[in-house]
């Protein structure tokens, strides 16, 4: 068993916070712009950070007619903050050839958020392995 690290694990903290943010966005799904968005799926381990960057670049935004616009924009700002660096060396990641964002299919905001949550879970699991 690994014990909790004494030094804050900023990446793990951030990934977990992001899961909470995605959960909140799912509550406000009906207030999101219905435009289709690039949503990576079946991401290989060494391409997780690049896939996450694709989610960050996607133009997820509140709809013009919806309520909670300010709150949603705050959540999206949180989502777009840079991830802290990995503690371990990431040579392997740089050698990997990852698909560019536009190669992933476009999905509704609902499925976009589902896939993003799935990726975050995968990144947490990978990070803890």
């Amino acid at each position: 068993h690994k014990s909790s690290p004494q030094r804050p694990d900023h990446l793990l903290i951030r990934l977990r916070h992001l899961m909470d943010i995605v959960e909140q966005l799912k509550i406000y799904e009906n207030d999101l712009d219905p435009e289709l968005l690039t949503a990576p799926q079946d991401v290989k381990g060494q391409c997780e950070h690049e896939a996450f960057a694709c989610f960050q670049k996607a133009k997820l935004k509140p709809s013009n007619t919806g309520n909670n616009k300010t709150f949603i924009n705050d959540l999206l700002a949180q989502l777009r903050r840079r991830l802290p660096a990995k503690r371990t060396g990431n040579k392997q990641r740089h050698m990997a050839k990852c698909p560019s964002c536009d190669l992933y299919e476009k999905k509704t905001p609902k499925e976009f958020l589902e896939r993003l949550k799935w990726l975050l879970q995968k990144m947490i699991h990978q990070h803890l392995s």
């Epitope: 804050p8 694990d9 793990l12 903290i13 977990r16 916070h17 959960e23 705050d74 949180q78």
Partner: antibody, heavy 117, light 106 residues
Framework: QVQLVQSGAEVKKPGASVKVSCKAS????????MHWVRQAPGQGLEWMGL????????IYNQKFKGRVTMTRDTSTSTVYMELSSLRSEDTAVYYC??????????WGQGTLVTVSS | DIQMTQSPSSLSASVGDRVTITCRAS??????LNWYQQKPGKAPKLLIY???RLHSGVPSRFSGSGSGTDFTLTISSLQPEDFATYYC????????FGGGTKVEIK
């Protein structure tokens, strides 16, 4: 070492508000978000919500939405939980707990709030 | 909301016994489960996080297992200081605690 020190016990009348504080030390305050959990006498634990200590972003349990407000003061490394429109069922021990990052890894000593007319 | 059901709600055991507490989630929560110990008049303490990882300073007689909806906390050899109430808690979607299991002296 990590310490969360909460304010003292409170007695309030129904309809009033209470504000509980939780002062953090022994770590960088803004690195960790904070949860609030309550426990009615002889009952289990109930999650109330959490606050992002670096960005005043909050997530509340729907049950308390509209009645609970969580805030923070980075200059004193303190988080606050205010509960309004108190009723007798709100009599409980209120705990702050550090979100660290997969669990509530350190807890305050608890603050007993008694709601009685 | 995800419901967490703990069983049994209480149990009596002796020092040296092997004790098992189970926790069931109303939907799949992967490995997003923690266990806490609480003694009367005290704040809860984290024992195990992410299903099976021991929090720092927790004795190795405590272990956790499971995945999906069914989880177990095991105390391999009960010690006098282990008589307490144990709570599971999911953190897959928001946070929910189980109802607790009180471990009493037989």
């Amino acid at each position: 070492q990590v310490q969360l020190v909460q304010s003292g016990a409170e007695v309030k009348k129904p309809g009033a508000s209470v504000k509980v504080s939780c002062k953090a030390s022994g770590y960088t305050f803004t690195d960790y978000w904070m949860h609030w959990v309550r426990q009615a006498p002889g009952q289990g634990l109930e999650w109330m919500g959490l606050i992002d200590t670096s960005d005043v972003y909050t997530i509340y349990n729907q049950k308390f939405k509209g009645r609970v407000t969580m805030t923070r003061d980075t200059s004193t490394s303190t988080v606050y939980m205010e509960l309004s429109s108190l009723r007798s069922e709100d009599t409980a021990v209120y705990y702050c707990a550090r979100y660290g990052p997969l669990a509530m890894d350190y807890w305050g000593q608890g603050t007993l709030v008694t709601v009685s007319s | 909301d995800i419901q967490m059901t703990q069983s049994p709600s209480s149990l009596s055991a002796s020092v040296g016994d092997r004790v098992t507490i189970t926790c069931r989630a109303s939907q799949d929560i992967s490995n997003y489960l923690n266990w806490y110990q609480q003694k009367p008049g005290k704040a809860p303490k984290l024992l195990i996080y992410y299903t099976s990882r021991l929090h720092s300073g927790v004795p190795s007689r405590f272990s956790g297992s499971g995945s999906g909806t069914d989880f177990t906390l095991t105390i391999s050899s009960l010690q006098p200081e282990d008589f307490a109430t144990y709570y599971c808690q999911q953190f897959h979607t928001l946070r929910t605690f189980g109802g607790g299991t009180k471990v009493e002296i037989k």
